[in-house]
């Protein structure tokens, strides 16, 4: 009973370095209780970006100092990552667990490719 | 660097209690789920218990439920877990280890032994 | 619970064979949630191979993981001395987490 995590392959950030992406999860059990965790890897390197654990039926919260905000309805949840760079590009990786009621269920997405490209500068005007 | 070292190990007769402690340090303790494992002598691996981050879920193995209570203080980055009416066949080195990013035990300590005989 | 079984108990090997450990579980496992683990007497376990082919940080690339389903391998291309020890599988996508219950590579 392996949880399958679904999320886009590629994403393009906004000019503003904003990049949402949806993770959707098939829950094979009733849970109430969900954490998400966005995780990025580059150069074999892996960093958190983000974590929310919330409650079925409820808001996503993330940290008031996090990069992340987000929403969920049912089994989907709807990622939005802010303050990006182009040094930020690299795979954006869902993670899921289910976190109550027993059994727990971990589900790792394959990642999406966020391409973050840094606006150019506005020409000085004479 | 990553490490988890355990402690509070020794020899105590059945039915009595103990507390182990595991002392986390080289990464932020509260963004992952820490487990204990077991192995008794000659033996292989047996997953007991674990807790995750803020320490409002827990899980246990049958062989310990109601038995044995994981709990941590993400404030002092260190694990414990109490062990209370031990009996002989709870005599094992117990593992404290990490739920890694991807979900396996990438980081484990030293072990501490724990020998329940009269 | 998800049972895992692994085969053979023992394997008795020379340096520089290949080594071929095998693991099979009573119901699929994800790829995904299927390590491997080395211990040495007197030693902690190691994480070799995490979701059935992935090395962990620091592994030779001697060490090699492949399977899905119900059947997973642990494969070492050429035993070094300091291979010889006991290896588990896990699983870990849902609890309880289980381990498989060892093979040990011994020196033929």
């Known amino acids: 009973k392996a949880m399958h995590v679904a999320q886009p392959a590629v994403v393009l950030a906004s000019s503003r370095g904003i990049a949402s992406f949806v993770c959707e999860y098939a829950s094979p059990g009733k849970a109430t209780e969900v954490r998400v965790t966005v995780l990025r890897q580059a150069d074999s390197q892996v960093t958190e970006v983000c974590a929310a654990t919330y409650m079925m039926g409820n808001e996503l919260t993330f940290l008031d100092d996090s990069i992340c905000t987000g929403t969920s309805s049912g089994n989907q949840v709807n990622l939005t990552i802010q303050g990006l760079r182009a040094m930020d590009t690299g795979l954006y990786i869902c993670k899921v667990e289910l976190m109550y009621p027993p059994p727990y269920y971990l589900g790792i997405g394959n990642g999406t490719q966020i391409y973050v490209i840094d606006p150019e500068p506005c020409p000085d005007s004479d | 660097q990553v490490q988890l070292v355990e402690s509070g190990g020794g020899v105590v007769q059945p039915g009595r209690s103990l507390r182990l402690s595991c002392a986390a340090s080289?990464?932020?303790?509260?963004?992952?789920?820490m487990h204990w494992v077991r192995q008794a002598p000659g033996k292989g691996l047996e997953w007991v218990a674990v807790i995750w981050y803020e320490g409002s879920n827990k899980y246990y193995a049958d062989s310990v439920k109601g038995r044995f209570t994981i709990s941590r203080d993400n404030s002092k980055n260190t694990l414990y877990l109490q062990m209370n009416s031990l009996r002989a066949e709870d005599t094992a080195v117990y593992y404290c280890a990490r739920g890694g990013d991807w979900g396996a035990f990438d980081i484990w300590g030293q072990g501490t032994m724990v020998t329940v005989s009269s | 619970e998800i049972v895992l079984t692994q085969s053979p108990g023992t394997l008795s090997l020379s340096p520089g064979e290949r080594a071929t450990l095998s693991c099979r579980a009573s119901q699929s496992v994800s790829s995904s949630y299927l390590a491997w683990y080395q211990q040495k007497p007197g030693q902690a376990p190691r994480l070799l191979i995490y979701?059935?082919?992935s090395r962990a940080t620091g592994i030779p690339d001697r060490f090699s993981g492949s399977g899905s389903g119900t059947d997973f391998t642990l494969t070492i291309s050429r035993l070094e001395p300091e291979d010889f020890a006991v290896y588990y599988c896990?699983?870990?996508?849902?609890?309880?987490?289980?381990f498989g219950q060892g093979t040990k590579v011994e020196i033929k």
């Open positions: 896990q699983q870990y996508g849902s609890s309880p987490w289980t």
């Open positions: 979701g059935a082919s």
């Open positions: 080289g990464f932020t303790f509260s963004s992952y789920g």
